[in-house]
Interface confidence: medium
């Protein structure tokens, strides 16, 4: 995933080394909260494999991505904006190894915001890159309704009110 001027781009399997791997994302969040369609292969083209990824200071590197764990607490939307302003996005969990890495680095047992919320437009849980959650993998405990956002705790995902304040994880 890449972020450019507040727009999230999804690149298949985290690699954009050739055009055939590019995947149109359709619905994408923009800084002002509106959505628009975008197809921008150029922004994806520069991203290559794990070995070229350099993480900024205070960011942890894992499997070609960079992660930042907050110490303060914010609402989901404030956390979302915080990550965007730092050219990243709230955490999207791709696989079990990534889940294990996240758990290893969460030193407390409290809830932590991730990049997943319930969109009333689609009436489904959606990652911040616009992709739907695979409900067979991630069972979200709690209500699926408007103003529900997802927080992780002990490798499980919980539905919480978006205005609640928790720590959060940014990723790029």
């Amino acid at each position: 995933l890449l972020v450019s001027q507040g727009v999230l781009l999804k690149c298949q399997k985290g690699s954009c080394s050739n055009a055939t791997q590019y995947e149109d994302t359709g619905d994408l969040k923009v800084n002002n909260g509106t959505r628009r369609n975008i197809s921008n292969k150029d922004l994806c083209a520069s991203r290559s494999a794990d070995q070229t990824v350099l993480c900024q200071s205070e960011w942890l590197k894992y499997q070609g991505k960079c992660y930042w764990f907050s110490n303060e607490m914010k609402s989901w939307s404030d956390s979302y904006v915080y990550c965007l302003e730092r050219k990243s996005h709230l955490l999207i969990i791709h696989d079990q190894l990534e889940m294990a890495f996240i758990q290893k680095n969460l030193r407390q047992l409290n809830y932590v915001w991730i990049g997943l919320n319930f969109t009333s437009l689609k009436m489904t849980w959606t990652w911040v890159d616009g992709s739907p959650i695979d409900s067979k993998i991630f069972f979200i405990k709690g209500p699926a309704k408007e103003n529900s956002c997802a927080a992780i705790k002990e490798s499980k995902i919980f539905s919480e009110t978006c205005s609640s304040v928790f720590k959060w994880i940014c990723q790029y």
Partner: antibody, heavy 113, light 110 residues
Framework: SLEESGGRLVTPGTPLTLTCTAS????????MSWVRQAPGKGLEWIGV?????SIWYANWAKGRFTISKTSTTVDLKITSPTTEDTATYFC?????????????WGQGTLVTV | ASDMTQIPASVSAVVGGTVTIDCQAS??????LAWYQQKPGQPPKLLIY???DLASGVPSRFSGSGSGTQFTLTITGVECADAAVYYC????????????FGGGTKVVVK
Amino acid sequence: SLEESGGRLVTPGTPLTLTCTASGLTVGSSYMSWVRQAPGKGLEWIGVIVPSGSIWYANWAKGRFTISKTSTTVDLKITSPTTEDTATYFCARDGASSGFYFDLWGQGTLVTV
Amino acid sequence: ASDMTQIPASVSAVVGGTVTIDCQASEDIESYLAWYQQKPGQPPKLLIYDASDLASGVPSRFSGSGSGTQFTLTITGVECADAAVYYCQQGHGYAHVDNAFGGGTKVVVK
């Protein structure tokens, strides 16, 4: 239908790969699991490979097994078998619209360590 | 991960009678539970999913109930063909699984 193959007698520590061959269904768009059953014992879910290609293992199975797939097959590699891995290994499809349930099973292949 | 406990481990039934098998989850799994029947030398067969929905081709003498942490499989009007081992299985998210299956209940029909 699903058919497992590759089960045999192996010595401890020798990696073994089992293959599940599907006919009449598309592996790439299915949730394909491996489940095992030791002689006279119950069923143990090992892991699943999902349409996106991501793989999720049971907590106890992490590091002991590797699941992969092609367009028509799903493989299970037992990385370093021990006597505790002696079992019949089944592949199963999760065809449920919600939740995960196994509606199609192979006949199983026996691994003896 | 939710652990599944089945009670009893074995049960005897008479033809025409009723059998109930209980399954307990260690945490709330809502209605994401299935029941399977397994006969010797065969793979398991899906009987019930989502706690109470009958799988295709399964006789109506099989029924399931429960939600949350407590579930029951009932066989009403037991037949000789129902002699088998029955397993419950939680189905509420691959990311959280230790073992999805209960330990099994052997049904002996007399």
